[in-house]
């Protein structure tokens, strides 16, 4: 979900935005800081083994409105939050995994202890 309000079409920021990046740092990042004309994000999702993994970084303006909308994906537990209000604003984003649905237990992978 977007933390700073929805807009119908993304408008270009007058200045570059710096974001914290983790597991999602582009080549042009330095010291785990990336730069963008769009949004900072933090995302939590389950990996193949069902372990929650947190990633953060930069989303370019192109397509970021769609990516920040956090549309549910079947059989994939994932949540993303985006922000633009200040540099490294995504340090303070803490998305949580959506609750498991009954169907997820049936359709999802079976984990053996």
């Amino acid at each position: 979900k977007k933390e700073d309000g929805e807009s119908t079409a993304p408008t270009a920021r007058p200045k570059v935005l710096r974001c914290k990046c983790h597991h999602h740092c582009p080549e042009d990042s330095v010291n785990n800081i990336c730069s963008t004309d769009g949004y900072c994000f933090t995302m939590i999702e389950e990996d193949d083994s069902g372990t929650p993994v947190v990633t953060s970084g930069c989303l370019g303006l192109e397509g970021s409105d769609f990516q920040c909308r956090d549309t549910p994906i079947p059989h994939q537990r994932r949540s993303i939050e985006c922000c633009t209000e200040r540099n490294e604003c995504n340090k303070d984003l803490h998305p949580t995994l959506p609750p498991l649905k009954d169907r997820d237990f049936v359709d999802g992978p079976i984990h053996h202890k």
């Epitope: 200045k15 570059v16 042009d28 330095v30 800081i33 730069s35 930069c58 540099n87 490294e88």
Partner: antibody, heavy 116, light 112 residues
């Protein structure tokens, strides 16, 4: 129109510190980063660092970490760069420059002379 | 740091001639957003630099259309189609893709 006003010259002694100023007008100060660039006579331009006046966030060139400190006063739309432990190597013209995704406007520069 | 290599260092021209200045970066200047942050500035004696071209090929406001920029990746060119007296000075390329931002060493455009 966008203007970045800098004092023309500063003369300081070796070992001392100096605080250079850059007063911005003609635009919303917090909507752009402010960068500082060094130019020595006959040499190229060197990027020192930048500050975002909206949240005081700074990025420095490693080479100038510990030498330069960038600050802003949003009430007067003024950016500052403090240079410490000055030596003759710090004698140069220092420019402030407005930055969005590229520098579009430069100050006229302050000529810093470090001499006893 | 990204090294910006400019050629030639000096460019003697006759007024009305075409002039080309080249800039090569030590790594690609294509940013992760897809933009290429390569820019050109002109510095006249005793003045601060002035922006001519931003993001490879976009003329800044008030810049005459005899100035044009081109290139991609690591190789870029600034062309002046018909040199005028007011064009004389030192031209710098600059990149703002990678921190620290860096500049070319400059090309001095002078009368032949």
């Amino acid at each position: 129109q966008v203007q970045l006003q800098q004092p023309g010259a500063e003369l300081v002694k070796p070992g001392a510190s100096v605080k250079l100023s850059c007063k911005a007008s003609g635009y919303t100060f917090t909507s752009y980063w402010m960068q500082w660039v060094k130019q020595r006579p006959g040499q190229g331009l060197e990027w020192i660092g930048e500050i975002d006046p909206s949240d005081n966030y700074t990025l420095y060139n490693q080479k100038f970490k510990g030498k330069a400190t960038l600050t802003v006063d949003t009430s007067s739309s003024t950016a500052y760069m403090q240079l410490s432990s000055l030596t003759s190597e710090d004698s140069a013209v220092y420019y402030c420059a407005r930055f969005g995704y590229y520098v579009d406007y430069w100050g006229l520069g302050t000529t810093l002379t470090v001499s006893s | 740091d990204v090294v910006m290599t400019q050629t030639p260092l000096s460019l003697p021209v006759s007024l009305g001639d075409q002039a080309s200045i080249f800039c090569r970066s030590s790594q690609s200047l294509v940013h992760s957003t897809g933009n290429t942050y390569l820019h050109w500035y002109l510095q006249k004696p005793g003045q601060s630099p002035k922006l001519l071209i931003y993001k490879v090929s976009n003329r800044f406001s008030g810049v005459p259309d005899r100035f044009s920029g081109s290139g991609s990746g690591t190789d870029f060119t600034l062309k002046i189609s018909r040199v005028e007296a007011e064009d004389l000075g030192v031209y710098f390329c600059s990149q703002s893709t990678h921190v620290p931002f860096t500049f070319g060493s400059g090309t001095k455009l002078e009368i032949k």
